[in-house]
Amino acid sequence: TPEVWVQVQMEATELSSFTVHCGFLGPGSISLVTVSWGGPDGAGGTKLAVLHPELGTRQWAPARQARWETQSSISLALEDSGASSPFANTTFCCKFASFPEGSWESCGSLPPSSDPGLSAPPTPVPILRAD
């Protein structure tokens, strides 16, 4: 069964910078990745980025840069301009649409005890549905 993993890390040098890493474990080719925060996309979450391997990438503030790391994983850099970081307690969700499997989504957040530079373990936390 395909799985999605989500990893959130705070940058050691910039406490206001976070990076979300997401990956798809399974066969098939990725057609679209949607990253959202505050919940799954379309279910209370707000879009942060959409990535397509050929058609391009798009991100929305506070996301700074979205890019492919491998053919099945992406990273999203976030910049927190506020004095206190809302990212620390936020859930980030990644939805991978793949052919022929359909859509798979998982969510993750920064562990409460995280030191800068440490990250949440890349454990898939399947939520919602596989369309």
Epitope: H52, L55, G56, T57, R58, Q59, Q65
Partner: antibody
Framework: EAQLQQSGPELVKPGASVKISCKAS????????MNWVKQSHGKSLDWIGD????????TYNQKFKGKATLTVDKSSSTAYMELRSLTSEDSAVYYC????????????WGQGTSVIVSS | DIQMTQSPASLSASVGETVTITCQTS??????LAWYQQKQGKSPQLLVY???TLAEGVPSRFSGSRSGAQFSLKINSLQPEDFGSYYC?????????FGAGTKLELK
């Protein structure tokens, strides 16, 4: 077949405002963001911004903030752009253009609306 | 914002000739470069995206390539309907930015 039908040409006075429309047909209106692009006479293309018809959320090119306001009417599958405090610099052809995910390629284009600012 | 430097600004060629238009980007946009064609008095139309993928219905005489931050659009064996203006555009985030354009005229 996707089609974008824009409103007709406008001749407006300096300092006035103008609102141009773009009616979409042939596709699901909420599946594509609506972009607006400016083309001054004989010049290149300038992206003004886009709007998500599903929730009305818009993104603007910094240089057009305060100049353009993007709105949509889902019930009629129509997008609007209002331009305010018009000057001769705003005289141009304005295009609406629809883009599907990830909303960075301009897939379908309207025929353009000419706006001339003159006293 | 990502700056797009397109050259040449204008180009005269004859039917049957081969021409190349280039576009240089100020930042790394990976392969996310598109080309649009605009005929006189008409709307622009997507021609090529992701550096070299032809949009639906685009003839194979059009081809795109990349060398570092420089992207090229090549048109082999020019046809009468190919004359007009060409614009490059990155599709790596917003704001979307375009090159200044290349006007391809009949010699």
């Amino acid at each position: 077949e996707a089609q974008l039908q824009q409103s007709g040409p406008e001749l407006v006075k300096p300092g006035a405002s103008v609102k141009i429309s773009c009616k979409a047909s042939g596709y699901t209106f909420t599946d594509y963001y609506m972009n607006w692009v400016k083309q001054s006479h004989g010049k290149s293309l300038d992206w003004i911004g886009d709007i998500n018809p599903d929730n009305g959320g818009s993104t603007y090119n910094q240089k057009f903030k305060g100049k353009a306001t993007l709105t949509v009417d889902k019930s009629s599958s129509t997008a609007y752009m209002e331009l305010r405090s018009l000057t001769s610099e705003d005289s141009a052809v304005y295009y609406c253009s629809a883009s599907g995910p990830p909303y960075v390629l301009l897939d379908y284009w309207g025929q353009g609306t000419s706006v001339i600012v003159s006293s | 914002d990502i700056q797009m430097t397109q050259s040449p600004a204008s180009l005269s060629a004859s039917v049957g000739e081969t021409v190349t238009i280039t576009c240089q980007t100020s930042e790394n946009i990976y392969s996310y470069l598109a080309w649009y064609q605009q005929k006189q008095g008409k709307s622009p139309q997507l021609l090529v995206y992701n550096t070299q993928t032809l949009a639906e219905g685009v003839p194979s005489r059009f081809s795109g390539s990349r060398s570092g931050a420089q992207f090229s659009l090549k048109i082999n064996s020019l046809q009468p309907e190919d004359f007009g203006s060409y614009y490059c555009q990155h599709h790596y985030g917003v704001p979307l930015t375009f090159g200044a354009g290349t006007k391809l005229e009949l010699k």
